[in-house]
């Protein structure tokens, strides 16, 4: 339900190919904004409601997901041990 849209390509400088990418997501009934495989996605609203963040599969394939204390977010642990933490405000 999400597509990557390229915005703001600088056409005044032909050598410059930097562009800003953004996701455009159309969620179905019962879904709201979330993260799947480290990208914007529409996810079951109940996941967000219950703060079971790992159920939306927010980490990249091969990474392990763990809930932070008080379900304030999640961590993604890479096979090499590096940990990326995401907190939800």
């Amino acid at each position: 339900t999400c597509e990557i849209v390229t915005l703001d390509r600088d056409s005044s400088q032909p050598r410059r190919t930097i562009a800003r990418q953004t996701a455009r997501c159309a969620c179905r009934k019962g879904q709201i904004a979330g993260t799947t495989r480290a990208r914007p996605a529409c996810v079951d609203a109940r996941i967000i409601k219950t703060k079971q963040w790992c159920d939306m599969l927010p980490c990249l394939e091969g990474e392990g997901c763990d809930l932070l204390i008080n379900r304030s977010g999640w961590t993604c642990t890479q096979p090499g041990g590096r940990i990326k933490t995401t907190t939800v405000s």
Epitope: R24, C25, C27, K29, G30, I32, A33, C42, A45, K49
Partner: antibody, heavy 129, light 103 residues
Framework: AVTLDESGGGLQTPGGALRLSCSAS????????MFWVRQAPGKGLEYVSE????????NYGSAVKGRATISRDNGQSTLYLQMNSLRAEDTGTYFC??????????????????????WGHGTEVIVSS | ALTQPSSVSANPGETAKITCSGG???YGWFQQKPGSALVTVIY???ERPSDIPSRFSGALSGSTNTLTITGVQAEDEADYYC???????????FGAGTTLTVL
């Protein structure tokens, strides 16, 4: 404070048309799914229509499908309901309502009837000859 | 169609419970007093607006939501409607309403 103010009601003739408006303030209108709900005199609440936060999706109750069009102007923070081929059974108070979830930029989100957290005071529509 | 009782009664100070079942996604509860505007007392299953007294609470169990008013007061006498999405998950639906009478 969140405020929803409906207008456009009044006495209408059967077969006629009307356009209801709901002016919103106190929140980021473009981030919320919105609803129209009606109540016939002495009766319960009835789902009429809803629209996604960006206006790309619409939905209608069976009683008005094919006769109603919901729309929104996010620049003016206004919700609309166009009703055609009016019938006596369309008589009632029409409420505008907001779904609580604040949809982030780049997303199109539906509201949820169970997530309605704010209501307007309603505008009365009477369809009679 | 949603199922909710047509009437519930309680004495002041008692606990009143109103159930609603038959929908999907989330449930809300909306209070209506004669001649007054609709007021949301519970939304998204168990969330309470900041201006609603703490005696109002909601709880979801399976596909049934229960509105509980702990320590009912005279001013709680009103009609209460539950709202959710129909079983197909494509359109909104409301219960027929429950009249709460405070004896």
């Amino acid at each position: 404070a969140v405020t929803l103010d409906e207008s456009g009601g009044g006495l209408q003739t059967p077969g006629g048309a009307l356009r209801l408006s709901c002016s919103a303030s106190g929140f980021t209108f473009s981030s919320h799914g919105m609803f129209w709900v009606r109540q016939a005199p002495g009766k319960g609440l009835e789902y009429v229509s809803e629209i996604t936060n960006d206006g790309s999706g619409t939905n209608y109750g069976s009683a008005v499908k094919g006769r109603a069009t919901i729309s929104r102007d996010n620049g003016q923070s206004t919700l609309y309901l166009q009703m055609n081929s009016l019938r006596a059974e369309d008589t009632g108070t029409y409420f505008c309502a907001r779904s609580t979830y604040e949809c982030p930029g780049g997303f199109s989100c539906w509201g949820d009837t169970g997530q309605i957290d704010a209501w307007g005071h309603g505008t009365e529509v009477i369809v009679s000859s | 169609a949603l199922t909710q009782p047509s009437s519930v009664s309680a004495n002041p100070g008692e606990t009143a419970k109103i159930t609603c079942s038959g929908g999907v996604y989330s449930y809300g509860w909306f209070q209506q007093k004669p001649g007054s505007a609709l007021v949301t007392v519970i939304y998204w299953d168990d969330e309470r607006p900041s201006d609603i007294p703490s005696r109002f609470s909601g709880a979801l169990s399976g596909s049934t939501n229960t509105l509980t008013i702990t320590g009912v007061q005279a001013e709680d006498e009103a009609d209460y409607y539950c709202g959710t999405e129909d079983i197909s998950g494509t359109a909104g639906v409301f219960g027929a309403g429950t009249t709460l009478t405070v004896l």
